[in-house]
């Protein structure tokens, strides 16, 4: 009886504490709309516990449902900046493997300078998330204005 | 063998269910940009399970990575209100201890009336979070328009 | 001694993995401001693990504190669309049982085309969440632009 009970306990390592919070490193070359991210305690308050960075893109290491969140602020931006350079759009998606490519989250700036959102989505080990900023405006690299993260929520 | 398995189980109290959701109490005097928060079931749907309020500011009681989220709506606001009084900015940060002071999350209203965002960040026991609303606009006190919360995510 | 320790372990089923992420199915008839949602793997990346849909509205199956999040984007929208048709407001609330009816989260579009926010709130088994979009603008049905979800956080 006690053995049956012990079986349904949740071992610590299966809890899936996978979590990451990244800061902007740089934008891509002109024809590459991707944002390139960096993370780690040496950089400030960013970190990766489980997921990894692959050439600035976030790669998932554990299957599960994740909360994905992002905030991007445009650099030296006023309420007219974004409207002058419309359309400026941010999309978060799975970019590899190609067979699983899909847009998960999309927002346009319109007359604002910041977009922020979050969603729950299933991700699989090996999925790489890309964040594409279309348009000609530079994002802010301030760590309190632009960030991207994931949190494992359940199997 | 069974003892080793039991050791890696996660005791309930170590799960770190720390969580809080606060509603706006009042703004500070003119030279104090901080928002003052309140929480508790007597006030409606706000609550504190773990963190505490210290003179209207949220104090963390457990080390870990937290999801911090906030929404602030400006009172009696139209699409031109924020632009009349530009700049109006909200910043969430650690304000004490002074040695750990840092801005975690920052958004400007520009031509909008509401900002909402969230991020993952490491917080330590004793960290006090302040929410600074710079500018001269009153925030809404409606509990579905202005709120601030944290959720412990992992050690 | 070991038995006492085993008692405070957390059984898997009590972890309350309840979670749902929904995509927009359709809007209601003219006098019904509610958005009608759908979810399930056959539809793409939406899912329900615990909560259920009741005529397009989300019904909670487990008491606890939940993170509720939403993003709604207006269809074929530019920065002037929302301002032409002001006010367009989204509210998420408990709509049944009537005794627990309350607005949990409210945002207006003003000059923007997307609203996105999240909050922690206590919900009880049987609570039905409704998302009311007031105004005359159609929301986008793109699954990366409009979505609604909940995540159980703690008892």
């Amino acid at each position: 009886q006690r053995f049956a009970q012990a079986q349904q306990q949740l071992p610590l390592e299966s809890l899936g504490w996978d979590v990451a919070e990244l800061q902007l490193n740089h934008t891509g070359p002109q024809q590459d709309p991707r944002l390139y991210w960096q993370g780690g305690p040496a950089l400030g308050r960013s970190f990766l516990h489980g997921p990894e960075l692959d050439k600035g893109q976030l790669r998932i290491h554990r299957d599960g449902i994740y909360m994905v969140h992002i905030q991007v602020t445009l650099a030296i931006c006023s309420s007219t900046t974004a409207s002058r350079h419309h359309p400026t759009t941010l999309a978060v998606g799975i970019c590899s493997p190609a067979s699983r490519s899909i847009s998960l989250l999309r927002l346009s700036f319109h007359q604002g300078c910041t977009i922020a959102s979050q969603r729950l989505t299933p991700l699989a080990r090996g999925d790489t998330l890309c964040t594409n900023l279309t348009g000609t405006l530079l994002p802010s690299r301030n760590t309190d204005e632009t960030f991207f993260g994931v949190q494992w929520v359940r199997p | 063998q069974r003892f080793a398995q039991a050791q890696q189980q996660l005791p309930l109290e170590s799960l770190g269910w720390d969580v809080a959701e606060l509603q706006l109490n009042h703004t500070g005097p003119q030279q104090d940009p901080r928002l003052y928060w309140q929480g508790g079931p007597a006030l409606g749907r706000s609550f504190l399970h773990g963190p505490e309020l210290d003179k209207g500011q949220l104090r963390i009681h457990r080390d870990g990575i937290y999801m911090v989220h906030i929404q602030v709506t400006l009172a009696i606001c139209s699409s031109t209100t924020a632009s009349r009084h530009h700049p109006t900015t909200l910043a969430v940060g650690i304000c004490s201890p002074a040695s750990r002071s840092i801005s975690l999350l920052r958004l400007s209203f520009h031509q909008g009336c509401t900002i909402a965002s969230q991020r993952l960040t490491p917080l330590a026991r004793g960290d006090t979070l302040c929410t600074n609303l710079t500018g001269t606009l009153l925030p809404s006190r409606n509990t579905d328009e202005t709120f601030f919360g944290v959720q412990w995510v992992r050690p | 001694q070991r038995f006492a320790q085993a008692q405070q372990q957390l059984p898997l089923e009590s972890l309350g993995w309840d979670v749902a992420e929904l995509q927009l199915n359709h809007t209601g008839p003219q006098q019904d401001p509610r958005l009608y949602w759908q979810g399930g793997p056959a539809l793409g990346r939406s899912f329900l693990h615990g909560p259920e849909l009741d005529k397009g509205q989300l019904r909670i199956h487990r008491d606890g504190i939940y993170m509720v999040h939403i993003q709604v984007t207006l269809a074929i929208c530019s920065s002037t669309t929302a301002s032409r048709h002001h006010p367009t407001t989204l509210a998420v609330g408990i709509c049944s049982p009537a005794s627990r009816s309350i607005s949990l989260l409210r945002l207006s579009f003003h000059q923007g085309c997307t609203i996105a926010s999240q909050r922690l709130t206590p919900l009880a088994r049987g609570d039905t969440l409704c998302t009311n979009l007031t105004g005359t603008l159609l929301p986008s049905r793109n699954t990366d632009e409009t979505f609604f979800g909940v995540q159980w956080v703690r008892p």
Epitope: - | A75, I76, T81, R84, H85, T136, L138, N142, E145 | -
Partner: antibody, heavy 120, light 111 residues
């Protein structure tokens, strides 16, 4: 200390325009808005319009076509101009500072007032 | 436009007694968790002076004998105990929306 001092003519011919300058001290026009209010025996206190810190204006609808409020932040001056005055525009005209909170729309300091008579 | 109706138009009160002035709005002046009603005092030959903002908050330098109350559409200004310097006309003002409007005023005289 906070002060608003008004200067302008006391007598205006019918169909002519009224110009009043409000010079402020003790606060900055880049932080505070300035309202204009008039007071007449027949209509009591009547809000006319406001210029905000960002230079944006809001006017009371009946006056929108003949009222202009501008400012010069560097000189701490707000300029009020109303066109096509008639006899029923006879009143005391006040400038008043908007309360610190820009969306509270209360007026916490007032000018001394400019008494204006519209008559030929 | 929101119309504010003050009553009485005038009242006479003895020194040390209570003066009560009412202001009624034709629709709610509450929004965003606040109630946007303010009170002013005006003495002859002077501009109005802000007394109370957001129903019940005393403006800087206003004595504690002034108090405001009310909600929704019905509001009250109380002065107790009335002093000689309180002889003036009192106005309510809403700021729920544009245009801002004022009540017609209540003249307080001393018996």
């Amino acid at each position: 200390q906070v002060q608003l001092k008004q200067s302008g003519p006391g007598l205006v011919q019918p169909s002519q325009s009224l110009s009043i300058t409000c010079t402020v001290s003790g606060f900055s026009l880049t932080t505070y808005g300035v309202h204009w209010v008039r007071q007449s025996p027949g209509k009591g206190l009547e809000w006319l319009g406001v210029i905000w810190s960002a230079g944006i204006t809001d006017y009371n609808a009946p006056f929108i076509s003949r009222l202009s409020i501008t400012k010069d932040n560097s000189k701490s001056q707000v300029f009020f101009k109303m066109n096509s005055l008639q006899a029923d525009d006879t009143a005391i005209y006040y400038c008043a500072r908007n309360d610190y909170y820009g969306n509270l729309y209360a007026m916490d300091y007032w000018g001394q007032g400019t008494s204006v008579t519209v008559s030929s | 436009d929101i119309v504010l109706t003050q009553s009485p138009a005038s009242l006479a009160v003895s020194l040390g007694q209570r003066a009560t002035i009412s202001c009624r709005a034709n629709k709610s002046v509450s929004a965003s968790g606040y109630t946007f009603m303010h009170w002013y005092q005006q003495k002859p030959g002077q501009p109005p002076k802000l007394l109370i903002y957001l129903v019940s908050n005393l403006a800087s330098g206003v004595p504690a004998r002034f108090s405001g109350s009310g909600s929704g559409t019905d509001f009250t200004l109380n002065i107790h105990p009335v002093e000689g310097e309180d002889a003036a006309t009192y106005y309510c003002q809403h700021s729920r929306e544009f245009p801002l409007t004022f009540g017609a005023g209540t003249k307080l005289e001393l018996k």
